[in-house]
Amino acid sequence: FERTRSLQDPCSNCPAGTFCDNNRNQICSPCPPNSFSSAGGQRTCDICRQCKGVFRTRKECSSTSNAECDCTPGFHCLGAGCSMCEQDCKQGQELTKKGCKDCCFGTFNDQKRGICRPWTNCSLDGKSVLVNGTKERDVVCGPSPADLSPGASSVTPPAPAREPGHSPQ
């Protein structure tokens, strides 16, 4: 089958890193600078991705593979193949259109990216709050009040926010 295909389509012989040049009797020509072909039998080479601005080059383009980008310090990748760079925030913040914004009461973010998440609802597991949550850290759940030995006590959770209504812990 391969031999038949080769006889019918001379382009199938062109390896990755080349293209089948119709202007030159379908000779396999090397990809021009700043272009690549990652598979054989291609009639054109693809233009290399350029990592500009907030993007920086993680892997240079070669004749057989595209360039790969990541983000400059202070930014992180989003999307397939790092299609976007998004600004980092501090722990205890999340990114909005206005920029980095402190987590709302009842939420936390322990990373420089992503969104603020609610504190764990300890009562769901029949536990109580051992350590209060902050903007940067989740609450720490401890044994339920009934499990505590005499004299021991757990931290009283802060009053839930009114707007929006965060569930009591």
Epitope: E86, T96, K101, I115, R117, T120, L124, E163, S167
Partner: antibody
Amino acid sequence: EVQLVQSGAEVKKPGSSVKVSCKASGYTFTSYYIYWVRQAPGQGLEWIGNIWPGNGGTFYGEKFMGRATFTADTSTSTAYMELSSLRSEDTAVYYCARRPDYSGDDYFDYWGQGTLVTVSS
Amino acid sequence: SVELTQPPSVSVSPGQTARITCKLNSGNIGSYYVHWYQQKPGQAPVTMIYRDDKRPDGIPERFSGSSDSSSNSAFLTISGVQAEDEADYYCHSYDSTITPVFGGGTKLTVL
């Protein structure tokens, strides 16, 4: 493929409760907010509240505090919304929706097909 | 608190351009992401525009989003309107990063 599949239509009596489910597939259930939104017949969209399935943390719209309860079962990737003390004005289509984790003011990228809850005596 | 106001209805002939307005009552529209959903009868909403002007995969280029600080409004523009574009359209933003706010919806009628 990301999907949110909701439970079927319900007819309830005033004063009773309803529990709507939203089964997620095609993504990591614990890493995205699930929002609950409702739409009364011929009306617009109204936020009920939301849950972070990763730890069960919840937020409720002021109008629904004390009446709505959100839970999530991570073993089945299913979120639940229970609404108690039903009245006729709770008749609506109830939607679950997923919010991406890119930014704090992001859109809802996937929605369930909706569950019609009819409250009638 | 944040409120978004939309006209109840917009009518347009096939092939013409429709523009749906979403007006922010307070604050600066430039500080808020606005998202747009299309909803057809008996169906769930579908994202047409997110983060002001971005189009999800599969949404035709006829749909575009923009905003104008002088009128403190966001806009959904549909160029070359087709019969299948007849639907309700909702804008969406946030009061706080937890609390979503929706416009009242605009019914687009294709004459």
